[in-house]
């Protein structure tokens, strides 16, 4: 049997060592003990008694099925306990009695049906994070379950087989920053929602089939809900159930952010909320994020005209990796307050973008992200976006563009342009002179000779440049990142010619450790203040005898340098 490995600070690693019991020889010097992924099955009352100063105990996936009632009695200093993914079919309050310092407790993935006969947590007054439940057997949430818990930073409940929720069970916790609920059906959603209205600031609903969700008024008095964020992950919705979900928003008037991740919409976007919902809901929602939305019939998707008025105040929208190929003009025109739009990893081409960025579209838009779409012409893209009078920042990275033409038109306020990973080989005057930040990293550039009088930040890493660009091109440059190119040297004169340069990241280049370069680096200790990742990323490529040495450590031969 293998043994534990411990470091000087008392952190002991015993993961995946085939332990069949808690190893002997544990001491009070241990601060952290990880026995995850073993075959321990049983923890006896004396197994951990020596660990009086233990702060972290991890026993994830160790096949534990029995823990003696007083097994943790000496762990008064314990702050982090992970018992997840074991074989504990019942939970005992006696385990947790002594753990008054506990901040993190993970009991998830054990085959219990309820959280024990009596309240488990009354003594855990410092608890901040609690994870409970499982996929198959956890079927009941009761009023006694959370007794003694008044405030939690994170509560995660996996209740995919929930058959009974006792009303007010979650109400006893007065403050929950982030509640994650894994529910397979929406049967108890309204009851739970009513109980957490006054306590939860961020509600995350996972793996829930909401197709049959039906709203009914909640049995709550006037409540000022602190909920700011609502997220749906892996949920299934229909056009009808979306309308019903909207009705919940009248109870969470401070809501500012809504998120849908990995959801499926079995519908066409033919939402038809009642007039009262449209007027009052989404009042303070400023951020809507949708990632990997699956719409089986996305070619039939509606233009969302029925919810235009819902979205007029929204400031930030992300619709990422959701097969968007066109945003209808009228929809764009109704997004009057929109300042940030991210359409990354979609299917937009310039010719359909033209429809989306029509006259009057996105009148307040400042930042547009079209990374990894199907854009092909930089010239057309710039021209199409001329309608966006307030656009300052454009990310068109990870599109494969045709060669850059000599001249292009861009929105006149544009200050930031991301052209990274676009396959460009040459930069031309197509790039606007108004830029303050330009990212052309991860391309095929072997030179950069474009005058950009306002440029403050240049990101040009992962290209093929052999020298630093000429400083006269960027009179006000503050930051240059040029790592992973083929730069062989830099000198005092070169660096000195950038009058305002504060940060230079030039590591992982092919430095020729000449006498000049090495004497410059030795004479200039202040390099550490300007060079990011100095000295570890600055290595000699040649001459052969210095290959792999740090510039800082490399010493030129006296013979070579005094010829």
């Amino acid at each position: 049997q293998e043994s534990l490995s411990c470091d000087a600070s008392g952190v002991c690693d015993g993961r995946s060592r085939s332990f069949t019991s808690i190893p002997s020889g544990l001491t009070a010097a241990m601060k952290s003990l990880d026995l995850s992924f073993n075959k321990i099955t049983y923890i006896g009352h004396g197994d951990l008694r020596a660990c009086a100063n233990l702060q972290v105990l991890m026993l994830k996936s160790s096949r534990i099925n029995t823990i003696e009632g007083d097994a943790f009695y000496s762990l008064g200093s314990l702050e982090h306990l992970d018992l997840s993914d074991n074989h504990l079919s019942s939970l005992s309050s006696s385990w947790f009695g002594p753990l008054s310092s506990l901040k993190y407790l993970n009991l998830m993935g054990n085959p219990y049906q309820t959280l024990g006969v009596t309240s488990l947590f009354p003594n855990l007054t410092n608890l901040q994070t609690l994870r409970i439940g499982n996929v198959e057997t956890f079927s009941e949430i009761r009023r006694i379950d959370f007794a003694g818990l008044t405030s939690l930073n994170e509560l995660e409940i996996k209740a995919l087989s929930l058959r009974n929720y006792q009303s007010q069970s979650l109400k006893s916790i007065r403050d929950i920053h982030h509640l994650t609920l894994h529910l397979s059906e929406s049967a108890f959603l309204l009851e739970i929602f009513a109980d957490i209205l006054s306590s939860v600031r961020y509600l995350e609903l996972r793996d829930t089939n909401l197709a049959r969700f039906q709203f009914s008024p909640l049995p709550v008095d006037e409540v000022s809900s602190p909920m700011k964020k609502l997220a749906f992950r892996g949920s299934v919705l229909t056009d009808e159930s979306f309308n019903e979900l909207l009705k919940l928003l009248r109870y969470i008037l401070e809501l500012s952010e809504v998120e849908f991740d990995d959801c499926t919409l079995n519908g066409l976007g033919d939402f038809n909320p009642s007039e009262s919902d449209v007027v009052s809901e989404l009042g303070k929602v400023e951020t809507v994020t949708i990632r990997r939305l699956h719409i089986p019939q996305f070619y039939l998707f509606y233009d969302l005209s029925t919810v235009y008025s819902l979205l007029e105040k929204v400031k930030r929208i992300t619709v990422e990796n959701s097969k968007v190929f066109l945003v209808p003009c009228s929809f764009s025109q109704h997004l009057k307050s929109l300042e940030f739009l991210d359409l990354s990893e979609n299917l937009m081409v310039e010719e359909y973008l033209k429809n989306s960025a029509c006259k009057g579209a996105w009148p307040s838009l400042q930042t547009l992200v079209l990374s990894q779409n199907h854009l092909r012409s930089m010239q057309k893209t710039g021209e199409i976006l001329l309608t966006l009078k307030n656009l300052t920042s454009l990310d068109i990275s990870r599109n494969t563009f045709h060669p850059m033409p000599d001249s292009c038109q861009w929105p006149e306020k544009m200050r930031f342009l991301n052209l990274s990973s676009t396959g460009i080989r040459v930069v031309k005057t197509c790039i606007p002179q108004t830029l303050e930040v330009l990212d052309v990293s991860n391309n095929n550039l072997d030179s950069f000779s474009l005058f950009l009088p306002r440029l403050q930040e240049l990101y040009i890493s992962r290209n093929k440049l052999k020298t630093l660009p000429d400083a006269s091109l960027f009179p006000v440059l503050l930051v240059m990142k040029i790592r992973e190119n083929a730069v062989s040297t830099f000198s005092k004169d070169q660096l000195g010619s950038f009058p305002k340069l504060e940060t230079l990241e030039a590591g992982d280049n092919h430095f020729v450790c000449s006498c000049e370069l090495l004497s410059f680096t030795m004479e200039t200790p202040a390099l550490a203040q300007i060079l990011v990742d100095w000295p570890d990323s600055y290595l000699c490529d040649s001459p052969p005898r210095l290959h792999g040495h740090r510039l800082q450590d490399a010493r030129p031969s006296v013979l070579e340098c005094h010829q």
Epitope: F325, Y352, H374, R398
Partner: antibody, heavy 118, light 111 residues
Framework: QVQLQQSGPELVNPGASVKLSCKAS????????INWVKQGPGQGLEWIGW????????NFNENFKDKAALTVDTSSSTAYMELHSLTSEDSAVYFC???????????WGQGTTLTVSS | DIVLTQSPASLAVSLGQRATISCRAS??????????MQWYQQKPGQPPKLLIF???NVESGVPVRFSGSGSGTDFSLNIHPVEEDDIVMYFC?????????FGGGTKLEIK
């Protein structure tokens, strides 16, 4: 440059299955959909379906739902179409094509000729 | 399914003249201001080649003598002036509704 290289001609017996391949190069495979199109001898074009390599999602012409299975191997940037229970009706040239902008097929493979005959 | 009817099935034209091929859809292929209609050219023994997408956008690298027009259900492909290289098959294709469908094709011939 963008290329879709399809596997060579196939001669198979009725009732058998065949797996055609389409190897992509010159573009980010996971960013585009791959479509399959059938062209019978001296005939028009018939859309079979698409697959999106990024998430493996597929969509089929109902006429081919029980006939074709679409898969991808993102590590080799290759799309596959397996055709089952072949009959002489399935003898045709099969093209793979890259789907751009969600709506048009801008690059096509050279086609694979399938002959079903005993 | 949306049925696309191309006419004529074959068209005889003189080199240097204009050729117009029509494609009629059994229902509208409009999607909020964009017509999801494409045109492809196919030479014998070769795969189809994209000429026009979104009814009127000429694909990069396609000669300017090719143009597309139309909206709703009626679309046309124009070639002017016709060159010898153009005397091949042409197909329209809609991507408004699944399943995507192609027209039956129009064969260009020299008059």
């Amino acid at each position: 440059q963008v290329q879709l290289q399809q596997s060579g001609p196939e001669l198979v017996n009725p009732g058998a299955s065949v797996k055609l391949s389409c190897k992509a190069s010159g573009f980010t495979f996971t960013t585009y959909g791959i479509n399959w199109v059938k062209q019978g001898p001296g005939q028009g074009l018939e859309w079979i379906g698409w697959i999106y390599p990024r998430d493996g999602s597929t969509n089929f012409n109902e006429n081919f739902k029980d006939k074709a299975a679409l898969t991808v191997d993102t590590s080799s940037s290759t799309a596959y179409m397996e055709l089952h229970s072949l009959t002489s009706e399935d003898s045709a040239v099969y093209f793979c094509a890259r789907l751009t902008g969600g709506t048009f097929l801008d690059y096509w493979g050279q086609g694979t000729t399938l002959t079903v005959s005993s | 399914d949306i049925v696309l009817t191309q006419s004529p099935a074959s068209l005889a034209v003189s080199l240097g003249q204009r050729a117009t091929i029509s494609c009629r859809a059994s229902e509208s292929v409009e999607y909020y201001g964009t017509s999801l209609m494409q045109w492809y050219q196919q030479k014998p023994g070769q795969p189809p080649k994209l000429l026009i997408f979104g009814a009127s956008n000429v694909e990069s690298g396609v000669p300017v003598r090719f143009s597309g027009s139309g909206s709703g259900t009626d679309f046309s492909l124009n070639i002017h002036p016709v060159e010898e290289d153009d005397i091949v098959m042409y197909f329209c294709q809609q991507s408004r509704k699944l399943p995507w469908t192609f027209g039956g094709g129009t064969k260009l011939e020299i008059k």
